[in-house]
């Protein structure tokens, strides 16, 4: 991305450099180094200090966003002297040109949509490009299918999420022939942006005294197991007065998802539908199709 790197250094420089693609800060190794330290300070004065790499002349920042501008700093002591150097990493380009209102969601277990809006001061010829890097392998995914508005990219559709990990870095760059365009970046957890499908294979079986509802957990992008799910059942008596409260039942995920409830014959016509959520986030899916049981003359 286009970004000015300005170095603030004493006479003998460490030649500090930052590669935004790998998030690696490096400097010239000094002989007889006794102490090295690197860190960044963001606009809110938060300090991030990663571990030094084995060679002690570089460090990699794992989970940082750069679009608000940051200052990197390196301190090195040798047996002879001490070095200090700052590297300013501003988000160059005209203020207000970066993509805004950026958000992504995963749906149907293996599809993802990201959307954004053009910056308020962005020129007419602005074009945005989305790059995604996963936290583990630093592999870069370029947007394969852009969603356009009057020729400007304002979203991205991905139908192959195999390159993602649980936490990913999203970067929206911009270009224009007229002026410099600022970038926008964000870190997103797949856990927090996935919208579940409703549970599948919902069935109801009744005997003379009880009804048993069974269902299967939804297929998800994240690898989740049965205890990671929470379900809500809406058991609804048909043809009741408007405003009558539905019975909402919370059920924890289990190896065999089932809910048994008393319902004696003759039973009125009922419907049941189920929705699912991650037990810790409770971001509810849409409801499953309603399944009817009982009879009109119950």
């Amino acid at each position: 991305e286009k970004s000015d790197l300005r170095t603030v250094a004493p006479a003998s420089s460490l030649n500090v450099r930052f590669d935004s693609r790998t998030m690696n800060l490096s400097w010239d190794c000094q002989e007889n180094t006794t102490f090295s330290k690197c860190f960044l300070t963001d606009k809110k004065n938060r300090v991030v200090e990663p571990r030094l790499s084995n060679n002690e002349c570089s460090c990699t920042f794992r989970e940082i966003c750069l679009h608000e501008g940051v200052t990197f700093e390196v301190h090195v002591n040798t047996s002879q002297r001490g070095f200090q150097q700052k590297l300013l990493y501003p988000n160059s380009g005209r203020e207000g040109t970066a993509a805004q209102n950026f958000s992504c969601f995963i749906y149907n277990a293996d599809l993802m949509n990201c959307t954004w809006a053009r910056g308020p001061t962005a020129p007419r010829d602005v074009q945005y490009f989305l790059y995604i890097r996963n936290s583990k392998r630093r592999r870069e995914i370029r947007c394969p299918y852009y969603i356009q508005d009057s020729g400007t990219h304002v979203g991205c559709h991905l139908d192959n999420l195999s390159g993602l990990t649980s936490r990913n870095y999203f970067l929206v760059n911009g270009t224009s022939r007229e002026i410099g365009i600022q970038f926008f970046d964000s870190l997103l957890d797949t856990k927090k942006i996935e919208r579940f499908n409703p549970p599948s294979n919902v069935t109801v079986r009744c005997n003379t005294t009880h009804c048993l509802v069974r269902w299967k957990q939804p297929r998800t992008y994240q690898k989740l197991s049965y205890l990671d799910f929470q379900y809500q059942l809406d058991v609804h008596r048909k043809n009741t007065q408007p405003g009558t409260e539905n019975l909402l039942i919370n059920v924890s995920g289990d190896l065999e998802n089932r809910y048994n409830f008393p319902s004696s014959e003759p039973r009125a016509k009922h419907s049941v539908k189920i929705r699912a959520a991650d037990v810790r986030i409770l971001n509810w899916s849409s409801w499953s199709e309603a399944i009817e049981f009982g009879s009109d003359d119950g």
């Epitope: 990990t165 856990k191 994240q222 690898k223 989740l224 205890l227 990671d228 810790r280």
Partner: antibody
Framework: QVQLVQSGAEVKKPGASVKVSCKIS????????IHWVRQTPTKGFEWMGG????????VYAQRFQGRVTMTEDTSIDTAYLTLSSLRSDDTAVYYC?????????????WGQGTMVTVSS | QAVLTQPSSVSGAPGQRVTISCTGS?????????VSWYQQLPGTAPKLLIY???KRPSGVPDRFSASKSGTSASLAITGLQADDEADYYC???????????FGGGTKVTVL
């Protein structure tokens, strides 16, 4: 009702290998993830390895690396643990367990355990 | 030496409340990774009691509850019963070991 049924107790000589099986009934193995944990009176519970969704493969605990292999035969809903180059301190009860949650791993259901004795 | 530290034993009279502590470090419970608790009756396999720090699987009575704060967690048993006499283990994940870690176990005796 889902159950994990493990193979019977084994007595092995040092240097030998042991293969423990874990048969799942009431559910399809292909829809589950199995981990293996052992228990000794001195060291307590030790995680040995299992499926890691982030890596999309079976991962092994560092201390068993190179000696342990975990395999599955989904056609007969059975998971296997093989431990080679057995030593006397491998004497333990070996458990297979179904992963109930991945964040972090929680063991929702355990097999009954297989006692492995390593003795010359 | 277990990675998570538990008292070796606790005891209480029937109907009483007992608590079991589980202390970890910044690479496991404090990381923060969730804690699970298991009950192991003599001669049997462990059974899950608590997951995600404080959630009970279906079938586990609400006499069992748990909480987590910082680098430690605790399990409480209220209305102690004779069949609660068992070993109890805490478990979490450790990022430095890249795997599950357990406590050494606490024997609960009903007086």
């Amino acid at each position: 009702q889902v159950q994990l049924v493990q193979s019977g107790a084994e007595v092995k000589k040092p240097g030998a290998s042991v293969k423990v099986s874990c048969k799942i009934s009431g559910h399809s193995l292909s829809e589950l993830s199995i981990h293996w944990v052992r228990q000794t009176p001195t060291k307590g519970f030790e995680w040995m390895g299992g499926f890691d969704p982030e890596e999309n493969e079976i991962v092994y605990a560092q201390r068993f690396q190179g000696r342990v292999t975990m395999t599955e035969d989904t056609s007969i809903d059975t998971a296997y643990l093989t431990l080679s180059s057995l030593r006397s301190d491998d004497t333990a009860v070996y458990y297979c367990a179904i992963v109930g949650s991945f964040s972090p791993v929680t063991y929702g259901l355990w097999g009954q355990g297989t006692m492995v004795t390593v003795s010359s | 030496q277990a990675v998570l530290t538990q008292p070796s034993s606790v005891s209480g009279a029937p109907g009483q409340r007992v608590t079991i502590s589980c202390t970890g470090s910044g690479s496991n419970i404090g990381a923060p990774y969730d804690v699970s608790w298991y009950q192991q009756l003599p001669g049997t396999a462990p059974k899950l009691l608590i997951y995600h720090n404080n959630k009970r699987p279906s079938g586990v009575p609400d006499r069992f509850s748990a909480s987590k704060s910082g680098t430690s967690a605790s399990l409480a048993i209220t209305g102690l019963q004779a069949d609660d006499e068992a070993d109890y283990y805490c478990q979490s994940y450790d990022s430095s070991l890249s795997g599950s870690v357990f406590g050494g176990g606490t024997k609960v005796t009903v007086l």
